[in-house]
Interface confidence: medium
């Protein structure tokens, strides 16, 4: 069956995140993959759209994040765009209302986004073949 | 061609408060970001705050927080920093800065003095 447009938006999106590093992207993040073994792939991505939403939710207006130059701030400010978006294709693509993240493993944002990437690029790559 | 004109500055004592203004012409004002960069003497550029287009959006560095109000007229095509509780580390020349993406077009900014 064809691809979900969510989920080439979803790979669009992890690409520009991936690329370009920011003074946050080393800060961490509940590592939901760390024991993802019993979880359905809805519950993987609900889990996914929750630590991203905890993240910028915290960190939009964080000084340290911001920065003192002005590209600094606008990488953080893309930085938080795409996570966003990152967020709500996810939410789209889960189909739930919410999911419980207790894992106690953390991981770097960046780790985090390149594992996701991963997933994503594997999914891809089974409903396109 | 993109022009922006500050005003407002001036000597003021610690603890005073000053109100800039930034005229902007020559683009569409509502469209854009706008930010407040300063420079203090003998160092870099550095942002003091920033705002969305339609003003509900709202950053400022730490060293500001507090004590710093940005605002923006879009009737007017007007940028504002209201600086209260003014210290002599605050003492800059401070721009006001069209914004998409990084900061793009300045003004020739206005000096502001702290000092007893």
């Known amino acids: 069956h064809k691809c979900d447009i969510t989920l080439q938006e979803i790979i669009k999106t992890l690409n520009s995140l991936t690329e370009q590093k920011t003074l946050c992207t080393e800060l961490t993040v509940t590592d939901i993959f760390a024991a993802s073994k019993n979880t359905t792939e809805k519950e993987t991505f609900c889990r996914a759209a929750t630590v991203l939403r905890q993240f910028y939710s915290h960190h939009e207006k964080d000084t340290r994040c911001l920065g003192a130059t002005a590209q600094q701030f606008h990488r953080h400010k893309q930085l938080i765009r795409f996570l966003k978006r990152l967020d709500r294709n996810l939410w789209g693509l889960a189909g739930l209302n919410s999911c419980p993240v207790k894992e106690a493993n953390q991981s770097t944002l960046e780790n985090f986004l390149e594992r996701l990437k991963t997933i994503m690029r594997e999914k891809y790559s089974k409903c396109s073949s | 061609e993109v022009q922006l004109l500050e005003s407002g500055g001036g000597l003021v004592q610690p603890g005073g408060s000053l109100r800039l203004s930034c005229a902007a012409s020559?683009?569409?004002?509502?469209?854009?970001?706008m930010a407040w960069v300063r420079q203090a003497p003998g160092k870099g550029l550095e942002w003091v705050s920033w705002?969305?287009?339609?003003?509900?959006?709202?950053y400022y560095a730490d060293f500001v927080k507090g004590r710093f109000t940005i605002s923006r007229d879009n009737s007017k095509n007007t940028l504002y920093l209201q600086m209260n509780s003014l210290r002599a580390e605050d003492t800059a020349v401070y721009y006001c800065?069209?914004?998409?993406?990084?900061?793009?077009?300045w003004g020739q900014g206005t000096l502001v003095t702290v000092s007893s």
């Open positions: 020559g683009f569409t004002f509502r469209n854009y970001g």
């Open positions: 800065a069209k914004s998409l993406g990084r900061f793009d077009y």
């Open positions: 705002i969305g287009q339609y003003g509900d959006e709202t």
